[in-house]
Interface confidence: low
């Protein structure tokens, strides 16, 4: 419906604490390098203005939409042409250009300093001191970091981050209470990040077509009793709510957000059996909630899908009649009986169940043609399968850190010319798909594994496409969204790449490491792996587990040294002539 | 229905080692961080180890630090204490605790086990 003023009907909506809280996010997900006193200035004076129109919605100026509004606001920041560059040359633009140009500049991998945390009694200091500043720079410093963060979800997290600091300030033992909520925060908010990343790939590289049919899989595995007519109105709705945020439209993500947990709660009878719970918390925790409550329990006795995929007459009439209909049919039907499948493998056979009803039902004997298209589904799916099999195996064999490292070793291999700290940051989170995965059941295994692998995939497509430098990553990452994984696996040893050349100092190491947290030595491990593959990527796997192992000992011998930095230059120097020998460098 | 079932706890002289252990059931364990608290005798609760889903990190009291080890097996459903030169004003009963993700109340956990340090 439309309103005089979009800013006081969103102001009236959401209230003034979550209206100010998500045009921070939306400001700092936009101009990431901008000091918060700056974003807090001018969130205020949007607040002001935003009062203004609530009172009188034909105030100057308050029928503008949003996008003038806050892109007018962004555009009166002094130091923009310094601090961003060509990103300035938007604030040229008109709307809705002017917006899209914001949207093409964010950046995945902005080079901010990494976020250290203080000590508890620091933190609990400046929390007691100044909440309401606290918590909005918790906000900022997430939402700059990740663009694309889910905006009504960081509120969430952000509520969440408070309640630990005003329970556990007043603790006895205060880091007891607040570490591993911290940890838990921090662990979950990249998670958060990294799902919403792929929403947001996939709208915007892909087209809203792809994303509704990832939620049609979804949503059916989720909710298999509700009717497809259900599942589709939830489409809808959810692809209006992930467009309006991965378009930096939060205000109206968040109020529509709001409008479908309400509308699910209050039809959950013929939607789910297991959103009872959810339904009875406050809005953030029942959004939260709903996102991630478990499959309901599949109706009993559910008929074949042949009959009506396969046997039926009238399939190539009901595939021409409505083809997006009949083929979200069709993917309704197969995802409600597969919670088991990923949500990738679902939406592959219903690409395969597509292609072939385009060939068939031009043919001159259309059911003869399609009569053995499930056929051709089996080795889809036991391609995942055997592959989730062998991983799961050597994860156990080898435990998380040395699983990391021979995909580490793998991709590497694949995709030599992605820099180091992509290939480690991407391999490692790969690696964590063992842990997370390999000890559910088979019947979770795969969407457990093959869907976060997607989610991974796509940090490596959305980093490499800032800085592209290998046509098969661009290859794998824009040819399909779901054959993204399976073109990955599919790379071989990459034949064409010149080995880099050797660089002492990449293997120069100093006593510092020896203070580092057991991850971040990890990773400099890690990182001297991938260097190591770089410059010898024929070396086999029992030469370069011979040189890391030495590395190792290197490292521990030397952080025992009484003299540990005389230890690293002198032990340093012999590792890296024997590890030359070693590899033939 | 979520079950949190402690053990291993009994009497034990100062400087002596137990290690008690908690089988829980009911809940996905491998994605809950999980705790130890113990009461003293006529004394309030007070929190002695913290372990993330993951197992790590951990976090200790300072009461406990460089004595008590917590760790878990997500494949046996199961927390463990491993309690090294144990003093007198460690007896309590000890319980394990499902860590809860936002407000700190205790929705779920076990009955204790009694650990009683004397000589």
């Known amino acids: 419906d439309a309103h005089k003023s979009e800013v006081a009907h969103r102001f009236k909506d959401l209230g003034e604490e979550n209206f100010k809280a998500l045009v921070l996010i939306a400001f700092a997900q936009y101009l990431q390098q901008c000091p918060f006193e700056d974003h807090v200035k001018l969130v205020n004076e949007v607040t002001e203005f935003a009062k203004t129109c609530v009172a009188d919605e034909s105030a100057e100026n308050c029928d503008k939409s949003l996008h003038t509004l806050f892109g007018d606001k962004l555009c009166t920041v002094a130091t923009l042409r310094e601090t961003y560059g060509e990103m300035a040359d938007c604030c040229a633009k008109q709307e809705p250009e002017r917006n899209e140009c914001f949207l093409q500049h964010k950046d995945d991998n902005p080079n901010l300093p990494r976020l250290v945390r203080p000590e508890v009694d620091v933190m609990c200091t400046a929390f007691h001191d100044n909440e309401e500043t606290f918590l909005k720079k918790y906000l900022y410093e997430i939402a700059r970091r990740h663009p694309y963060f889910y905006a009504p979800e960081l509120l969430f997290f952000a509520k969440r981050y408070k309640a630990a600091f005003t329970e556990c300030c007043q603790a006895a033992d205060k880091a007891a209470c607040l570490l591993p909520k911290l940890d838990e925060l921090r662990d979950e908010g990249k998670a958060s990040s990294a799902k919403q990343r792929l929403k947001c790939a996939s709208l915007q590289k892909f087209g809203e077509r792809a994303f509704k049919a990832w939620a049609v899989a979804r949503l059916s595995q989720r909710f298999p009793k509700a009717e497809f007519a259900e599942v589709s109105k939830l489409v809808t709705d959810l692809t209006k709510v992930h467009t309006e945020c991965c378009h930096g439209d939060l205000l109206e993500c968040a109020d529509d957000r709001a409008d479908l947990a309400k509308y699910i709660c209050e039809n959950q009878d013929s939607i789910s059996s297991k959103l009872k719970e959810c339904c009875e918390k406050p809005l953030l925790e029942k959004s939260h909630c709903i996102a991630e409550v478990e499959n309901d329990e599949m109706p009993a006795d559910l008929p074949s899908l042949a009959a009506d995929f396969v046997e039926s007459k009238d399939v190539c009439k009901n595939y021409a009649e409505a083809k997006d209909v009949f083929l979200g049919m069709f993917l309704y039907e197969y995802a409600r009986r597969h919670p088991d499948y990923s949500v990738v493998l679902l939406l592959r056979l219903a690409k395969t169940y597509e292609t072939t009803l385009e060939k068939c039902c031009a043919a001159a004997d259309p059911h003869e043609c399609y009569a053995k298209v499930f056929d051709e589904f089996k080795p889809l799916v036991e391609e995942p399968q055997n592959l989730i099999k062998q991983n799961c195996e050597l994860f156990e064999q080898l435990g998380e850190y040395k699983f990391q490292n021979a995909l580490l070793v793998r991709y590497t291999k694949k995709v030599p010319q992605v820099s180091t700290p992509t290939l480690v940051e991407v391999s490692r989170n790969l690696g964590k798909v063992g842990s997370k995965c390999c000890k559910h059941p088979e019947a979770k295994r795969m969407p457990c594994a093959e869907d976060y692998l997607s989610v991974v995939l796509n940090q490596l497509c959305v980093l490499h496409e800032k800085t592209p430098v290998s046509d098969r990553v661009t290859k794998c990452c824009t040819e399909s969204l779901v054959n993204r994984r399976p073109c990955f696996s599919a790379l071989e040893v990459d034949e064409t790449y010149v080995p880099k050349e050797f660089n002492a100092e990449t293997f120069t190491f100093h006593a510092d490491i020896c203070t580092l947290s057991e991850k971040e030595r990890q990773i400099k491990k890690q990182t001297a792996l991938v260097e190591l593959v770089k410059h010898k990527p024929k070396a086999t796997k029992e030469q370069l587990k011979a040189v890391m192992d030495d590395f190792a000992a290197f490292v521990e011998k030397c952080c025992k040294a009484d003299d540990k930095e005389t230890c690293f230059a002198e032990e340093g120097k012999k590792l890296v002539a024997a590890s030359q020998a070693a590899l033939g460098l | 229905e979520v079950q949190l079932l402690e053990s291993g706890g009994g009497l034990v002289q100062p400087g002596g080692s137990l290690r008690l252990s908690c089988a829980a059931s009911?809940?996905?364990?491998?994605?809950?961080?999980m705790l130890w608290v113990r009461q003293a005798p006529g004394k309030g609760l007070e929190w002695v180890s913290v372990?993330?889903?993951?197992?790590?990190?951990?976090y200790y009291a300072d009461s406990v630090k460089g004595r008590f080890t917590i760790s878990r097996d997500n494949s046996k459903n199961t927390l463990y204490l491993q309690m090294n030169s144990l003093r007198a004003e460690d007896t309590a009963l000890y319980y394990c605790?499902?860590?809860?993700?936002?407000?700190?109340?205790?929705?779920?956990w076990g009955q204790g086990t009694l650990v009683k340090v004397s000589s």
């Open positions: 605790a499902k860590f809860p993700s936002s407000r700190m109340k205790f929705d779920y």
């Open positions: 009911g809940f996905t364990f491998d994605t809950s961080s």
């Open positions: 372990i993330h889903q993951s197992g790590t990190p951990t």
